[in-house]
């Protein structure tokens, strides 16, 4: 034996399935037999690696059987049908029922054939991104934080970054046992260059159809950045007046802007308005230094500028002019 | 009801043969597979052999080859073992029994090889 | 071929008992094995298929395990009515294979 015939029956199935927590998932196991071939099948069989005895048995004579009745129950399997199709599904799927299992058909005149099948329990992660507020701290902290809460099995987390900096990622229990919250830091010395900069956290999981993409927006806390804009060394006496502005980069945004100058208080010819510092025409040549003192949530900072104004050429009477 | 009833005792000669026969009711012949089991006197069980009534495939045990044959009849839903050739080592009771495992059991059929 | 193996050829026990036939499979038979019971004069009778499920009309004392190669039929409360013989069989692959039997007396 087996008996003669074009070729042998075969028990067919996929080697791995993949299941969600908590859903239900079906186990394909089909009996092919080939065009010549004869057989008769007298039960469906499903049994589990290292378990003793059966899950689900399907007799001809008997109908089904399961060793959980509420979580078990074969697809397509009838009294009175042939047994070709022993596709069984399970409901409400634990972390435990992940494993081998064994699908078996007993078959006249071949015998028992049977396959193994491998359930992954799987459970899709939820995934978050956030943003780590900091300062200027002169050293590497973590700028930006990536979370995927619940995955089975971890999530793998990269991060895609113009910045420089590295990762930390770790690993706990999810809330779900059998489950895993990766949690991923991006690493980075806190610069103002990386105020407003973004990175982008990548969490692939297998039941995922692409990888995610979730971008976070750097946020570094700092001290006004100043510098003085608006002279061109060729400020001349009796032009329209002209005007010097105060840039301040800075996070928070700046709250105040103070103009003064080495001497102490503005001249009569300053005039302070805001960021913007109005000078007037003046008649006489002057060689001023100005202040001007920005504050912000974290401090103040101040850049100085020395203006002069020269008896210039007749020729050239707008050289001061600036607006 | 399933029920298999099988034929009558036999006494048989040495050398002869007999044909024993297991008459099927209360299920569709068809259905299930056909088994035949010999007990020797205070013995265990042994398998001679099946069919499938379907399709008149058989499977033997190699023991048995060229001792047993198998048949059906499905007109009359009845499947028939022939012993050839019997010795005293034959002499037992012989039972059908469908299904596998083996289910539904004939009464049995003693058979006693003597001269 | 499977041999299938019942080393206790006799086992004695009281009404009310509970007793343990075991049979061993010389291979793999994974849960094909079935359990029958033969009264004196009787054909046998199916109790248990599929290592551990009883068939329809069997008393739930009767109660069969495991898988593989070892395989248990334990009957609790034992009957006067269950004065029998008990024989295993393995139907995973052909020649199907019974063990000798395990004779239950009843004291």
């Known amino acids: 034996w087996p008996p003669p015939g074009t070729g042998d029956i075969i028990v067919q199935a996929p080697t791995q399935v993949p299941g969600f927590l908590g859903d239900s998932v079906t186990l394909p196991c089909y009996l092919q037999v080939p065009g010549m071939e004869e057989t008769h099948v007298s039960q469906l069989t499903w049994s589990r690696h290292g378990e003793s005895g059966s899950m689900a048995v399907f007799h001809q004579t008997q109908g089904p059987n399961y060793s959980e009745p509420k979580r078990l129950e074969f697809v397509a399997a009838r009294l009175g049908t042939e047994l070709r199709d022993a596709s069984l599904r399970m409901f409400g799927l634990r972390v435990e029922d992940e494993g081998n299992y064994t699908c078996l058909f007993v078959t006249f005149p071949q015998g028992s054939r049977s396959v193994d099948i491998w359930l992954r329990v799987l459970a899709k992660p939820q995934n978050t991104a956030e943003v780590q507020k900091v300062q200027l701290t002169g050293k590497p902290v973590p700028v930006a934080r990536c979370v995927s809460t619940g995955g089975r099995p971890p999530a793998h987390i990269t991060w895609h970054s113009d910045l420089g900096g590295m990762p930390n990622t770790s690993q706990a229990p999810g809330f779900l046992s059998g489950t895993v919250t990766v949690t991923s830091l991006w690493i980075l010395v806190p610069s103002s260059q990386v105020d407003g900069k973004s990175v982008t956290c990548k969490v692939e999981h297998e039941s995922f159809e692409k990888p995610q993409l979730l971008t976070v927006n750097l946020t570094v806390y700092y001290p006004p950045e100043v510098s003085i804009s608006g002279y061109d060394n060729n400020w001349y006496l009796s032009q329209n007046e002209a005007t010097l502005t105060c840039d301040a980069r800075s996070n928070p945004e700046p709250t105040g802007y103070n103009w003064s100058t080495t001497m102490g208080p503005l001249p009569p010819f300053a005039v302070a308005q805001g960021a913007q510092l109005l000078i007037r025409p003046v008649d006489k040549p002057i060689n001023t230094t100005f202040i001007c003192n920005v504050t912000n949530a974290l401090g103040a900072r101040q850049a100085e500028l020395t203006v002069q104004v020269k008896e210039g050429p007749p020729s050239e009477p707008s050289g001061m002019s600036s607006n | 009801e399933v029920q298999l009833q099988q034929s009558g005792p036999e006494l048989v000669k040495p050398g002869a043969s007999v044909k024993i026969s297991c008459k099927t009711s209360?299920?569709?012949?068809?259905?299930?597979?056909m088994h035949w089991v010999k007990q020797s006197h205070g013995e265990s069980l042994e398998w001679i052999g099946g069919?499938?009534?379907?399709?008149?495939?058989?499977n033997y045990n190699q023991n048995f080859k060229g001792k047993a044959t198998l048949t059906v009849d499905k007109s009359s839903s009845t499947a028939y073992m022939e012993l050839r050739s019997l010795t005293s080592e034959d002499s037992a009771v012989y039972y059908c029994?469908?299904?596998?495992?083996?289910?539904?059991w004939g009464q049995g059929t003693s058979v006693t090889v003597s001269s | 071929d499977i041999v299938m193996t019942q080393s206790q050829k006799f086992m004695s026990t009281s009404v009310g008992d509970r007793v343990s036939v075991t049979c061993k499979a010389s291979?793999?038979?994974?849960?094909?094995v079935a359990w029958y019971q033969q009264k004196p004069g009787q054909s046998p009778k199916a109790l248990i298929y599929?290592?551990?499920y009883r068939y329809r009309g069997v008393p739930d004392r009767f109660t069969g395990s495991g898988s593989g190669t070892d395989f248990t039929l334990t009957i609790s409360n034992v009957q006067s009515e269950d004065l029998a013989d008990y024989f295993c069989?393995?139907?995973?692959?052909?020649?199907?294979?019974f063990g000798s039997g395990t004779k239950l007396e009843i004291k």
């Open positions: 069919i499938d009534p379907n399709n008149g495939g058989t």
């Open positions: 069989q393995q139907y995973n692959s052909y020649p199907l294979a």
């Open positions: 291979q793999n038979v994974y849960t094909n």
């Open positions: 599929s290592a551990s």
């Open positions: 209360g299920y569709t012949f068809t259905e299930y597979t």
């Open positions: 029994a469908g299904v596998i495992p083996l289910e539904y």
